[in-house]
């Protein structure tokens, strides 16, 4: 009897949908695997007789519940199928946005770039998929614990009237208010402000 794949899960970030599993202990030899998806009531092969322990399902439609399954095989024997259901638009992890930061005197000027999507045109981003897409920004004075959060209305934001000659750190994430779903934070970007632009009297 061939044992089934173990720890079967979907690892999906920005609609790059990778079904992953672990090979079970099997004394007779090396196992291969077949992974399938349900399409119009018929299971279709996606990865056949692979020695890998993952299979790319990024070409699935983004909406709808998908049934995926994987089994282990050895010679003419095979395990039972292990099934999972997956809805990309609900289940995919929202990766960190890109961010450009520029210092102008005592202000930080930030521009945000929504994450790109696997198997899409360059300009079709996560912002196009989710109508309610917005950004959360948090910033803090480097070396302090107190963080301030803002929700920009646009793809850019300016933090004004900051302390001169002080290093501030900023990070951004995508947020979907209608789903109350937050994405991953970007890596902090830390920049030092320069002088206060106000002219002395």
């Amino acid at each position: 009897m061939v044992p089934p794949p173990e720890n079967v899960r979907m690892n999906s970030v920005n609609f790059k949908n990778i079904l992953q599993w672990e090979s079970p202990a099997f004394a007779k030899g090396n196992l291969t695997f077949t992974a399938q998806y349900l399409s119009y009531r018929i299971f279709q092969d996606k990865c056949m007789n692979t020695t890998l322990t993952e299979c790319d399902f990024s070409s699935l439609s983004k909406y709808g519940d998908h049934t995926l399954r994987v089994r282990a095989e050895f010679a003419d024997e095979h395990s039972d199928w292990v099934n999972i259901t997956f809805c990309p638009v609900d289940d995919t992890i929202i990766g960190p946005p890109g961010m450009q930061v520029e210092v102008l005197a005592d202000s930080l000027h930030m521009r945000f770039l929504a994450p790109k999507i696997e198997n899409e045109y360059e300009t079709w981003t996560m912002k196009n998929v989710y109508n309610s897409w917005t950004y959360n920004v948090q910033y803090w004075k480097n070396g302090t614990d107190e963080k301030f959060q803002i929700t920009p209305q646009y793809d850019f934001e300016v933090l004004r009237n900051l302390e001169p000659w002080t290093t501030y750190c900023v990070q951004v994430r995508g947020f979907l208010p209608d789903r109350n779903k937050a994405g991953e934070w970007s890596e902090p970007v830390c920049e030092q402000t320069t002088h206060d632009e106000t002219v002395p009297s």
Epitope: Y63, T123, N128, N131
Partner: nanobody, 124 residues
């Protein structure tokens, strides 16, 4: 059931232009995303362009960027694909597709309704 009807295909010389149209028969083209795809002889389906109803944004495959323009005329319930500087490699059957959800642009899996296609041949 929605029926999409493409028109405007034909034979054109390299460097020439064509304008394809996509209309919904007896229905409004009121879908979040309308896309154009093409299938060259012996090849798979390839995404060409799409237009989003929510913000009017347009998106293109690298192979057609700067040469093709997608647009929509809501008063005529029609989406157009203006194709300029045509090349032999643009020869294909061109399909219009509509998405109910508007989540995707390039992948055929994200579209729900399809037209029958119109042939475009670029040859001298």
């Amino acid at each position: 059931e929605v029926q999409l009807v493409e028109s405007g295909g034909g034979l054109v010389q390299p460097g020439g232009s064509l304008r394809l149209s996509c209309a919904a028969s007896g229905n409004s083209l009121d879908y979040p995303t309308i896309g154009w795809f093409r299938q060259a002889p012996g090849k798979g389906l390839e995404g060409v362009s799409c237009i989003s109803a929510s913000d009017g944004s347009t998106h293109y495959a690298d192979s057609v960027k700067g040469r093709f323009t997608i647009s929509r005329d809501n008063s005529k319930n029609t989406v157009y694909l203006q194709m300029n500087s045509l090349r032999a490699e643009d020869t294909a059957v061109y399909y219009c597709a509509a998405s109910l959800w508007g989540a995707g642009c390039k992948s055929e899996a994200d579209y729900d309704y399809w037209g029958q296609g119109t042939q475009v041949t670029v040859s001298s």
